[in-house]
């Protein structure tokens, strides 16, 4: 019995087609992805093949103005239109709190939304009961397939799930649910979830009875043969894991941003064994036409976005200096504003020991593309912020050793004075450079704000300590020559859309007046 699994993950609000790098579409003939194009391909496959499932492995939320404005209603609407069969909860589905998940998505989705390792407690338990499920048995042709969901147990550190959701270990939580499916005589089981490729592989290895793992979170690109675009494969598609009980379990993921549609064909025998598995992600490029009815719907929903981008978010009473003449040479108040917003966006999980889980921010000065003049009545709009941060990136959470941070700050000034983008703006960090010293030895003082303290204060950076840092995904991926970050990071979790982080902060503060205050000397 042959099953075709179509899958997406980490779409991050890319409802409209995008450029090849998943930023705003400029030249339509070269654009990719988007729900209208995805629908065309999905329908083509549904017509051609008998047993098809369309699955999403989480993180539909967060990433463009679509999410900022529609707050998840757009996800429910267009996923319903595409007739998704199931979705797993990702960490970003909790970005607007549990209410921001329940109302727009859980209550509106016409497909099951899954996670076996999220347990509700207290007053939330009855409120959310039945709105998401640990598993769902889906009829497919003459057969049934069990889908069991999972979500990163790091979600409380990455998003805002509140205090009434407990995120259990994925493997511990999945095993009893898979066992339950087996007792229901369901012998074809897909684990669909959002914990990253390493955890996906562990699930394939450790959870008895899981036949296929469809993952997300790590934006992993797998491909067999010559890849069709710029993404470099992390392995073959599917990636085969040998389970502890001796079975070959295919593991798949489909990069991110709706650029590809994962396409996996599985042949099962009567016992539910995977006899063969093959496929590849399908690049959703302009050779696939956008479906006209979905496209018309997108255009209808778009109108509200254009109105939103000119509305006032808040006011500034000072000039926001985002000029390259400042931000690539010295501390600039636009850099301070953005870093403060980045830390503020990650305020969560205080306890008796820690006032917050992260206190530090770094930001390449070259990523700040425009100032904002306060003389326009002080008004700040989304449009203004899009000029400052035009690349459509995210502000991510990484874990780095102190020694890596020290290398990053040396790189920041290794060719100082040439107006290059690698000069770092900071938050929760005090750095002193001596530019008379030779490159690679210019950082003379590097103090960082403590997190394990009731009164935050600056302490010298310890080379062997592991620190959490918020930074642009561009830096996490080694951009502007920060190869040491990419090579040495110990953990990397994708965060929220950059403009959204700053706009939310400005809306919260209402009036802002960031200063140059001696963070960089």
């Amino acid at each position: 019995w042959e099953l075709t699994i179509l899958h997406t993950n980490d779409v991050h609000s890319r409802l409209e087609q995008t450029s090849e790098d998943s930023s705003k579409c400029v030249n339509a003939s070269r654009c990719m992805g988007g729900v209208a194009r995805l629908f065309t391909k999905v329908q083509q496959i549904r017509r051609a093949e008998p047993n098809v499932l369309l699955l999403d492995a989480g993180d539909q939320y967060q990433g463009t103005i679509w999410f900022t404005v529609y707050k998840g209603a757009e996800v429910a609407h267009f996923m319903n239109a595409l007739r998704y069969d199931a979705m797993a909860l990702g960490n970003h589905e909790f970005d607007n709190g549990v209410e921001g998940l329940i109302e727009p998505l859980l209550k509106e989705a016409k497909f099951p939304i899954l996670s076996a390792n999220i347990k509700a407690k207290g007053p939330l338990a009855s409120q959310i009961s039945g709105l998401y499920l640990p598993y769902k048995v889906l009829p497919v042709g003459d057969e049934v397939v069990g889908i069991v969901g999972y979500t990163s147990k790091e979600t409380p550190f990455l998003s805002n799930p509140g205090t009434n959701l407990v995120f259990e270990d994925e493997i511990t939580a999945l095993q009893p649910e898979v066992d339950k499916l087996k007792t229901l005589n369901v012998n074809k089981i897909i684990a669909l979830g959002h914990s990253g490729f390493e955890t996906d592989k562990l699930i394939a290895q450790k959870v008895r009875g899981v036949d296929v793992v469809v993952g997300g979170h790590s934006n992993t690109f797998l491909y067999t043969g010559n890849p069709p675009s710029k993404e470099v494969p992390a392995g073959k598609y599917p990636f085969i894991v040998t389970s502890d009980d001796g079975r070959k379990v295919p593991v798949v993921q489909a990069y991110a941003f709706g650029k590809y549609l994962g396409y996996l064909k599985i042949e099962f025998d009567e016992r539910g064994n995977v006899i063969s598995s093959h496929g590849n992600p399908i690049l959703l490029n302009s050779s696939i036409p956008e479906d006209p009815s979905i496209k018309a719907d997108i255009n209808k929903w778009r109108i509200k976005l254009d109105n939103y981008s000119t509305q006032e978010l808040g006011k500034t009473i000072v000039y926001l200096d985002g000029s390259s003449q400042s931000c690539r040479f010295r501390e600039c108040n636009m850099g301070n504003l953005i870093c403060d917003a980045m830390i503020n966006n990650n305020l969560r999980h205080a306890d008796e020991m820690f006032w917050n889980h992260v206190s530090m921010c770094i930001l390449n000065g070259g990523g700040i593309r425009s100032p904002i003049d306060e003389r326009n009545n002080g008004t700040i709009t989304w449009e203004n912020l899009a000029a400052v941060l035009p690349f459509g990136g995210t502000f991510d959470l990484v874990q780095l050793k102190g020694s890596t941070l020290k290398k990053a700050f040396e790189h920041s000034v290794h060719r100082y004075g040439q107006s290059t983008g690698e000069f770092l703006q900071v938050g929760g960090i005090h750095v002193v450079y001596d530019l008379s010293r030779k490159p690679g030895d210019r950082v003379v003082k590097l103090d960082v704000l403590c997190t394990k303290c009731r009164v935050p204060s600056y302490d010298p950076l310890k080379m062997d300590e592991i620190y959490k840092v918020i930074l642009p995904n561009f830096l996490a991926n080694g951009g502007d020559g920060f190869q040491m970050i990419k090579d040495e990071l110990l953990r990397h979790d994708s965060g929220d859309q950059d403009i959204n982080v700053v706009s939310t902060y400005i809306s919260k503060m209402k009036v802002i007046y960031p200063a140059v205050e001696g963070r960089i000397k």
Partner: antibody, heavy 114, light 107 residues
């Protein structure tokens, strides 16, 4: 649990035909196909062909084409294998086996003797 | 048709021995290979499917490996109940074909 139960032993004369049945249970019968395999006394296994239950599609080994007919009765989840123009070398145990031979019938002995 | 050449055709071994049986295909069959066990009474049982996946209930002393045209069944420590005849089967292309069998006997 998958189970395949075959019909009883048959003794046939050369030139005659034999029809062996295989009743399946414990799985979604229409979603899969069934194989027929035979084993002559003291010999190895020989694949004869397969039938897809849902559509009745068949694929026969060239060696048996024209002599073998595989059919299906979906209402009783039963597959049949008929072999015609029997000769002495068709004396063998005939097995039905699920799609990728994960489960086997108990075998049906067919003896061709004058 | 794809020919499957199985070797050895028979072998004698003692309990606890490591036993290796090989199947060579006349052309590349990908991973499309099963290993079957037939006990003297005639009952057939699949041990390994898709070259290396172990059927449920099959002891972990059985393992399969290989690719392309060369495939191997290994019994890491032979047990009394393992004395039987073993067959490989390729299902990469029609007609499916079996190896000639390997009879494992008590030394």
């Amino acid at each position: 649990e998958v189970q395949l139960v075959q019909s009883g032993a048959e003794v046939k004369k050369p030139g005659a035909s034999v029809k062996v049945s295989c009743k399946a249970s414990g799985y979604t019968f229409t979603a899969y196909f069934m194989n027929w395999v035979r084993q002559a006394p003291g010999q190895g296994l020989e694949w004869m062909g397969r039938i897809y239950h849902n559509k009745g599609d068949t694929f026969y080994s060239q060696k048996f084409k024209g002599r073998v007919t595989m059919t299906v009765d979906k209402s009783t989840s039963t597959v049949y294998m008929e072999l015609s123009s029997l000769r002495s070398e068709d004396t063998a145990v005939y097995y039905c086996a699920t799609s990728y031979v994960g489960d086997w019938g108990q075998g049906t002995t067919v003896t061709v003797s004058s | 048709d794809i020919q499957m050449t199985q070797s050895p055709s028979s072998l004698s071994a003692s309990v606890g021995d490591r036993v290796t049986i090989t199947c060579r295909a006349s052309q590349d069959i990908g991973d499309s290979l099963n290993w079957l066990q037939q006990k003297p009474g005639g009952a057939l049982k699949r041990l390994i499917y898709a070259t290396s996946s172990l059927d449920s209930g099959v002891p972990s002393r059985f393992s399969g490996s290989g690719s392309g045209t060369e495939y191997t069944l290994t019994i890491s420590s032979l047990q009394p109940e393992d004395f039987a005849t073993y067959y490989c089967l390729q299902y990469a292309s029609f007609p499916w074909t079996f190896g000639g069998g390997t009879k494992v006997e008590i030394k």
